[in-house]
Structures are given as C-alpha cells and as structure tokens.
C-alpha cells in the first residue's frame, strides 16, 4: 500500500529502485531502461511501459538509465601505446589496456600511458611489474637507482643524491688503497 502524500511530499519522494520520476509529471514513476538501451519516450502513465530503444553501433549504456542518448564508445589512445582489450558493445564500453610486459602510468584519473616494465639490469627485481606499477629494482653494489634503472657509480656526480648510495663504495676503494700502503 502506498501511503497518502501531499503534493510537496510526493514531489520530494524518490521512486523505488529501478524507476525514475517522470520529468513532466512528478506523480508518475517510470521504469528505467535496461543497460544497452536508452530512453526514447517516457512512460505515458503509471504502470505503462517506458519506450526504450537499443543503442546504435558506436554507443553504449552500461547500467539501467533514463538517458536521452547512449554514451559514445571510448577509443583507445594509440599515441599513449594503448591497445584494445575488448571492443565496445551496446552495454559495455571499450576496454583499453597495455601489451604484455608493460604497465600503465596514469597521468590523471582517466588517462594512462603504456610503458615497458624495467628489467633491472645490474640489479635484482624487488617487486615484480604490476598492471599499474613498474618493476621495483634493487641495484647491485657499485650501482645506484636513477629513474628506475641501475646506473654505475662512476656516473655519480657529487651534487646528486647518489653520493649517499655510492659513498660506501668510494670509501671501500679508499680503504683498500690505504691498507695497501701500510
């Protein structure tokens, strides 16, 4: 049973799940359109069907809705190295991803670029490459990490952060030289 409501309460009330308020008559709750379809015409009255039409090629709706138009399918961004994992259907957007042995670097919330996973040459893999994170490398002695690559300490300039990492190596060399002179 539906309790009696005044106009204001009726206007402020929310339709049950799966229904929406008719835009011209807030006393009518229309059934939402299924995913893969969009709203062509609102239901004419209570208990009457909403006129929903299937999305055309190149468009989709991924959930029940009362959209006047389907959403345009996303295109994978080739310039970002993206590849199509699955194509767009009427009820699902295009899924874009990266190739094998690549990870996604998100420039912003919805924009990612594909990069090759680091191989950790002159080091060891500390954490394997993940879908959204590059390999984490640990460098061998005599090497320091610069932009996730193990670089020889011979390339370490005094002003760089690497001096801390390469210092023990330098001290060891000095130590062996000192011990050799005694």
């Amino acid at each position: 049973l539906v309790p009696h409501l005044g106009d204001r309460e009726k206007r402020d009330s929310v339709c049950p799940q799966g229904k929406y308020i008719h835009p011209q008559n807030n006393s009518i709750c229309c059934t939402k359109c299924h995913k893969g379809t969009y709203l062509y015409n609102d239901c004419p009255g209570p208990g009457q069907d909403t006129d929903c039409r299937e999305c055309e090629s190149g468009s989709f709706t991924a959930s029940e809705n009362h959209l006047r138009h389907c959403l345009s399918c996303s295109k994978c961004r080739k310039e970002m190295g993206q590849v199509e994992i699955s194509s767009c259907t009427v009820d699902r957007d295009t899924v874009c991803g990266c190739r094998k042995n690549q990870y996604r670097h998100y420039w912003s919330e919805n924009l990612f670029q594909c990069f090759n996973c680091s191989l950790c040459l002159n080091g060891t893999v500390h954490l394997s490459c993940q879908e959204k994170q590059n390999t984490v490398c640990t460098c061998h002695a005599g090497f320091f990490l610069r932009e996730n690559e193990c670089v020889s300490c011979s390339n370490c300039k005094k002003s760089l952060e690497c001096t801390k990492l390469c210092l023990p190596q330098i001290e060891n060399v000095k130590g062996t030289e000192d011990s050799g002179t005694t």
């Epitope: 670097h105 420039w107 912003s108 919330e109 919805n110 670029q113 990069f115 590059n134 932009e147 996730n148």
Partner: nanobody, 120 residues
Framework: EVQLLESGGGLVQPGGSLRLSCAAS????????MGWVRQAPGKGLEWVSM????????YYADSVKGRFTISRDNSKNTLYLQMNSLRAEDTAVYYC?????????????WGQGTLVTVSS
C-alpha cells in the same frame, strides 16, 4: 597560490634550438606530473610533452618526438623543454602546465606562456 613562470622563448631560425624553462611555486612540485602545451596562431591547444613526478615516464606528441626533450629539476622546482631541429610549424605560444590528478588529459594550472617563433 600556484604560479608557473615560463621563459626562454624567442625568434629562432629553422633547424635551430631553444631551451624553455618553467619556474614553479605555490605547490609541492615533486608530487605532480608536469607538461608543456602549445597553441599555434589560430589553432587549438596541443599537448607537446609530459613528465612524471619522479619516475622515468615521459610523453611526447608524434610531431616533436626525437626533437624535443622534457626534463625537470625537482631540487629547483623547475621544468625544462629542450627544443632542437625547430621547424616553422613549431611556432606557437608554449605553456607550462601542472597536470591534474583528476579527470582526463586535464591541466589544472598553466602559466602565461612564452612565444616561440621559428622563421628565417
């Protein structure tokens, strides 16, 4: 207040080089990806290059690949764009931009721009 101040633009002959700089202040520079955007006369904005906040990740538009190099010095809060083998079509106002972490391909702040003119 976020401030991005570009410098280094000017008139250069085709085949020449320029180095643009962008001094950033008002935010934690090391936390954000940064980029360069350009606008040629009578045209829309075009992404040129982006660089991640710490890692090795960079992006270059196809039109500048192999000619331009983006870099940053986090100790100086400065972004750079080294432009070599300049062409007439590189003529534009170049803007330094802070990349938003939300939305898609969005810059939330950019500077006043520096004009690069490539002409003989």
């Amino acid at each position: 207040e976020v401030q991005l101040l570009e410098s280094g633009g000017g008139l250069v002959q085709p085949g020449g080089s320029l180095r643009l700089s962008c001094a950033a202040s008002g935010f934690t520079f090391t936390r954000y990806s940064m980029g360069w955007v350009r606008q040629a006369p009578g045209k829309g904005l075009e992404w040129v290059s982006m660089i991640a906040h710490a890692g090795p990740e960079t992006y270059y538009a196809d039109s500048v690949k192999g000619r331009f190099t983006i870099s940053r010095d986090n100790s100086k809060n400065t972004l750079y764009l080294q432009m070599n083998s300049l062409r007439a079509e590189d003529t534009a106002v170049y803007y330094c931009a802070k990349i938003s972490q939300f939305g898609s391909n969005a810059f939330d702040y950019w500077g006043q721009g520096t004009l690069v003119t490539v002409s003989s």
